[in-house]
């Protein structure tokens, strides 16, 4: 008769949100609160992820899907499914073991996360520097000197920084 049963696997008819209950003849039972089964035919329900501390809830857990977390302000997600929260830094900085540090001269970071990256070397493409780089912004490359019209000159390359880690202003 029509119990949650098929010829192959008696659990195959248990819908998402339920589990195949070994305690009572493999009848489908609803997942308990704070647990879920995202697919049919499951023999157990998975415990819902809890977004605690630096994590905050982006999507509540339901009987058929896990909770989803993101990070509280001042932090950003890392890893699959936001498995970690990492501290934000300011633009022009990178996170080190000792905290947020300014980008070294010749490097930049235009985001609140990630590492400082070297300025583009315009000369590798036969171009010149149109706009100087800063710790927050990459240089802007312009046309090569040969492409300039007569009488025009390229922008002067940046002078050495007075302080390490800072570009000239």
């Amino acid at each position: 008769f029509e119990r949650t049963r098929s010829l192959q696997d008696p659990c195959s008819n248990c819908p998402a949100g339920t589990f195949c209950d070994n305690n009572r003849n493999q009848i489908c039972s609803p997942c308990p609160p704070n647990s879920f089964s995202s697919a049919g035919g499951q023999r157990t329900c998975d415990i819902c992820r809890q977004c605690k501390g630096v994590f905050r809830t982006r999507k509540e857990c339901s009987s058929t899907s896990n909770a989803e977390c993101d990070c509280t302000p001042g932090f950003h997600c890392l890893g699959a499914g936001c498995s970690m929260c990492e501290q934000d830094c300011k633009q022009g900085q990178e996170l080190t073991k000792k905290g947020c540090k300014d980008c070294c001269f010749g490097t930049f970071n235009d985001q609140k996360r990630g590492i400082c990256r070297p300025w583009t070397n315009c000369s590798l493409d036969g171009k010149s520097v149109l706009v100087n780089g800063t710790k927050e912004r990459d240089v802007v490359c312009g046309p090569s000197p040969a492409d300039l019209s007569p009488g025009a000159s390229s922008v002067t390359p940046p002078a050495p920084a007075r302080e390490p880690g800072h570009s000239p202003q």
């Epitope: 008769f1 819908p15 949100g17 339920t18 009572r24 609803p30 997942c31 308990p32």
Partner: antibody, heavy 123, light 108 residues
Framework: QVQLQESGPGLVKPSETLSLTCTVS????????WSWIRQPPGKGLEWIGR???????NYNPSLKSRVTMSVDTSKNQFSLKLSSVTAADTAVYYC?????????????????WGQGTTVTVSS | EIVMTQSPATLSLTPGERATLSCRAS???????LSWFQQIPGQAPRLLIY???TRATGIPARFSGSGSGTDFTLTISSLQPEDFAVYYC?????????FGQGTKVEIK
């Protein structure tokens, strides 16, 4: 707290289809099975079947060929249809929340019932 | 299906007496899935006991349940006027869920 309310015609003609709706208030219909039970006059309780919020069903074999259950989660309602009725289907029809587990896997029986609605099959 | 048989069909007692109601299953039922209901005439059944021995919310301590396997018992230690009603056992261990035929506790 969760409350259930049955509604539908009190009188159905023989050979026609009995249709009842149970409205869930004070809580969500989601994540539970929901049962229908009936009680003929002066007799005991008979389980008709149950439905999960996804629409998955289990029916009593004695009624299976005539029973259809459905659910409308947007309205927090579930429904019973019983076709080809006869006088033997005259009864008080109850809806109830089916058994469920708490977080510690303690099992609770049919803990919430509607007050019941009387259906008479007569021409 | 699992057949639930209750005895006696009727129990005639006076207020203050002890009531012992029996429920027997045609095959073994895990006690987690055995419930007792009380039904007062004109009202819906009310869950009294679940898991064979756990009182539902708001149920007085004079009601107790026991048993395992195929034999289960509901005991009312001292009958109160409001306890005269019909009592049903029910299993949801295996489909289809089944009820006993009921025991009527009446005033002697």
């Amino acid at each position: 707290q969760v409350q259930l309310q049955e509604s539908g015609p009190g009188l159905v003609k023989p050979s026609e289809t009995l249709s009842l709706t149970c409205t869930v208030s004070g809580g969500s219909i989601s994540s539970y099975y929901w049962s229908w039970i009936r009680q003929p006059p002066g007799k005991g309780l008979e389980w008709i079947g149950r439905i999960y919020t996804s629409g998955s069903t289990n029916y009593n074999p004695s009624l299976k060929s005539r029973v259809t259950m459905s659910v409308d989660t947007s309205k927090n309602q579930f429904s019973l249809k019983l076709s080809s009725v006869t006088a033997a289907d005259t009864a008080v029809y109850y809806c109830a929340r089916d058994g469920w587990y708490d977080e510690d896997y303690n099992y609770y029986g049919m803990d919430v019932w509607g007050q019941g609605t009387t259906v008479t099959v007569s021409s | 299906e699992i057949v639930m048989t209750q005895s006696p069909a009727t129990l005639s007692l006076t207020p203050g007496e002890r009531a012992t109601l029996s429920c027997r299953a045609s095959q073994s039922v895990s006690s987690n899935y055995l419930s007792w209901f009380q039904q007062i005439p004109g009202q819906a059944p009310r869950l009294l006991i679940y898991g064979a021995s756990t009182r539902a919310t708001g149920i007085p301590a004079r009601f107790s349940g026991s048993g395992s396997g195929t034999d289960f018992t509901l005991t009312i230690s001292s009958l109160q006027p409001e306890d005269f009603a019909v009592y049903y056992c029910q299993q949801d261990y295996d489909l289809p869920w089944t009820f006993g035929q009921g025991t009527k506790v009446e005033i002697k």
